[in-house]
Interface confidence: medium
């Protein structure tokens, strides 16, 4: 019969013969011959291969390093990578989440609209007319300025958005 | 020189409590966000809470969520954590940290106080 010039999926063509591929997790160590099967040896620890393959060699897992502010999110197998993602308060700088930068801080005048999480940063926004944020802080929000007449004071000095109101006493008139 | 120094830990049995305590100074307390973290034993460092400056603001993860509440006296450059419904797997050593400003992942780490969580 003619040598096949394509193969069924999960095998490949060599020396003009089908050959299985090697499954996930498992790494070619010799092609099938016309009397043998192909040989695959599982990846060693801290390796993997994620799909059916003729590599000779399996990939190494991800390290996750600490000192760029990275940790492990999911372990690696013979069949997955490890997954990395950042440290409380920081955050990826790409998809492949190879650093981690800090999460930056909102100024004051600013407040947190989303709070960081391991892939993005934290979201500020200004505060409106009658909020206030008066410190740099990657948790804090604007707040509202205190209301003086729900404590039966007035205002003596107007609110801005990095200070809150300053309440007084209500003037007495005199008789 | 900054120093944070955490207190109150101690062995307690599960569903307990207990309050951590943690005196900070030699920087501006007030203006500073502030976080626990813990190391269990034979693990990685864990994030417990968050707390904004002010106070106002305070986040928690999902697995302390609902039984440790954090909270701030500025008054007094004391940082807590109050911690309820204690289980065995709350054992761990406890830090006070004050959030990064640098590339540094902390500013600055108490030397932790261990709480453990045993009948």
């Known amino acids: 019969p003619e040598p096949p010039t394509a193969c069924r999926e999960k095998q490949y063509l060599i020396n003009s013969q089908c050959c299985s591929l090697c499954q996930p997790g498992q790494k070619l160590v010799s092609d099938c011959t016309e009397f043998t099967e192909t040989e695959c040896l599982p990846c060693g620890e801290s390796e993997f291969l994620d799909t059916w393959n003729r590599e000779t060699h399996c990939h190494q897992h991800k390290y996750c390093d600490p000192n760029l502010g990275l940790r492990v999110q999911q372990k690696g197998t013979s069949e997955t990578d490890t997954i990395c993602t950042c440290e409380e308060g920081w955050h990826c700088t790409s998809e492949a989440c190879e650093s981690c930068v800090l999460h930056r801080s909102c100024s004051p005048g600013f407040g947190v609209k989303q709070i960081a999480t391991g892939v993005s940063d934290t979201i500020c926004e200004p505060c409106p007319v009658g909020f206030f944020s008066n410190v740099s802080s990657a948790f804090e929000k604007c707040h509202p300025w205190t209301s003086c007449e729900t404590k039966d004071l007035v205002v003596q000095q107007a609110g801005t958005n990095k200070t809150d109101v300053v309440c007084g006493p209500q003037d007495r008139l005199r008789a | 020189e900054v120093q944070l120094l955490e207190s109150g830990g101690g062995l307690v049995q599960p569903g307990g409590s207990l309050r951590l305590s943690c005196a900070a100074s030699?920087?501006?307390?007030?203006?500073?966000?502030m976080k626990w973290v813990r190391q269990a034993p034979g693990k990685g460092l864990e994030w417990v809470s968050s707390i904004s400056p002010n106070g106002w603001d305070t986040y928690y993860a999902d697995s302390v969520k609902g039984r440790f509440t954090i909270s701030r006296d500025n008054s007094k450059n004391t940082l807590y954590l109050q911690m309820n419904s204690l289980r065995a797997e709350d054992t761990a050593v406890y830090y006070c940290?004050?959030?990064?400003?640098?590339?540094?992942?902390?500013?600055?780490w108490g030397q932790g106080t261990l709480v453990t969580v045993s009948s």
């Open positions: 940290a004050k959030s990064p400003s640098s590339r540094l992942k902390f500013d600055y």
């Open positions: 030699g920087f501006t307390f007030g203006e500073s966000d």
